[in-house]
């Protein structure tokens, strides 16, 4: 068990802060909830603190919750591939470029680390080149979320990881908006981290609303499990 992994044996409170600017539309989001890495479970509620969110909530899910991949459930035989927990408590920097097909792109920079007993995901997001009447600024996405696989590989040069995946957002007319994600994670501290073999995270997310919440918001339930590395030969012969 890495030193960081010991911090995730129980339920951990999560705080998310985002400052965003998409095509000049500025906004802020605050999120709170908890994570339980034993089950790979996240429960979070996000509120736009600046009024109405200028982009559809589903386009921010990867920035919020795929941001705290330290809550992914890594099975016993894969624990030596869990970069995310091994970087704790000092944390990691997570940078992404998200290309929305036939539309603009988001660039995000985030810091994920412990502050006291709370795991904090602090993010800034800049979006450019979006069409005012496109699927994103035109709010044409359905309020739901598909399951995805998130592919992880080691980046030995930077003592971190590189991550690639493609999100499929459902559009109201029945078509799909693709969002290509290119991600890089580097540790903040200079302690040792686990550099993984290639594997993937399997994610399932459910979006809902709080009937008592008047402000623009999103409620998120998510389960994430690591997969893609089989037991070693010694395991087979036990």
């Amino acid at each position: 068990m890495s030193k960081g992994e010991e911090l995730f044996t129980g339920v951990v409170p999560i705080l998310v802060e985002l400052d965003g600017d998409v095509n000049g539309h500025k906004f802020s989001v605050s999120g709170e909830g908890e994570g339980d890495a034993t089950y790979g479970k996240l429960t979070l509620k996000f509120i736009c603190t600046t009024g109405k969110l200028p982009v559809p909530w589903p386009t921010l899910v990867t920035t919020f919750s795929y941001g705290v991949q330290c809550f992914s459930r890594y099975p016993d035989h894969m624990k030596q591939h869990d970069f995310f927990k091994s970087a704790m408590p000092e944390g990691y920097v997570q940078e992404r470029t998200i290309f929305f097909k036939d539309d603009g792109n988001y660039k995000t920079r985030a810091e994920v680390k412990f502050e006291g007993d709370t795991l904090v995901n602090r993010i800034e997001l800049k979006g450019i080149d979006f069409k005012e009447d496109g699927n994103i600024l035109g709010h044409k996405l359905e309020y739901n979320y598909n399951s995805h696989n998130v592919y992880i590989m080691a980046d030995k040069q930077k003592n971190g990881i590189k991550v690639n995946f493609k999100i499929r957002h459902n559009i109201e007319d029945g078509s799909v908006q693709l969002a290509d994600h290119y991600q890089q994670n580097t540790p903040i501290g200079d302690g040792p981290v686990l550099l993984p073999d290639n594997h993937y995270l399997s994610t399932q997310s459910a979006l809902s609303k709080d009937p008592n919440e008047k402000r623009d918001h999103m409620v998120l339930l998510e389960f994430v499990t690591a997969a893609g590395i089989t037991h070693g030969m010694d395991e087979l012969y036990k």
Epitope: E90, V93, R109, K113, R122, E124, T186, I188, G189, D190
Partner: nanobody
Framework: QVQLVESGGGLVQAGGSLRLSCVAS????????MGWFRQTPGREREAVAA????????YYSDSVKDRFTISIDNTRNTGYLQMNSLKPEDTAVYYC????????????????WGQGTQVTVS
């Protein structure tokens, strides 16, 4: 308690240079980032440049790229902002700031601030 003391501001002609210094004290700054923001009356603070203490990662705003250089001297706990080819629009109060972790361009994410030093380009 972290203390930040800036110096090096002043009046300079367009095209000239200045070097701002920021001495940080009150703790060890390994794992920290340092940034320089600037502010003109009636406007919010804008990020100019930032650097991690290890100098692995830096940021420059588009308006100062190729003119300003940020650096850190770990042995002296001091950060510098070398400003070349100064323009009248660089006139502002320049603030040094530090935070634990990485840099951001969002001012509210930074925790400790200096008093600021005035830079005037005529």
């Amino acid at each position: 308690q972290v203390q930040l003391v800036e110096s090096g501001g002043g009046l300079v002609q367009a095209g000239g240079s200045l070097r701002l210094s920021c001495v940080a004290s009150g703790r060890t700054f390994s794992g920290y980032a340092m940034g320089w923001f600037r502010q003109t009356p009636g406007r919010e603070r804008e990020a100019v440049a930032a650097i991690t203490w290890s100098a692995h990662s830096t940021y420059y705003s588009d308006s100062v790229k190729d003119r300003f250089t940020i650096s850190i001297d770990n042995t002296r706990n001091t950060g510098y902002l070398q400003m070349n080819s100064l323009k009248p629009e660089d006139t502002a109060v320049y603030y040094c700031t530090v935070r634990h972790g990485t840099w951001f361009t969002t001012s509210r994410y930074w925790t400790d601030w200096g008093q600021g030093t005035q830079v005037t380009v005529s």
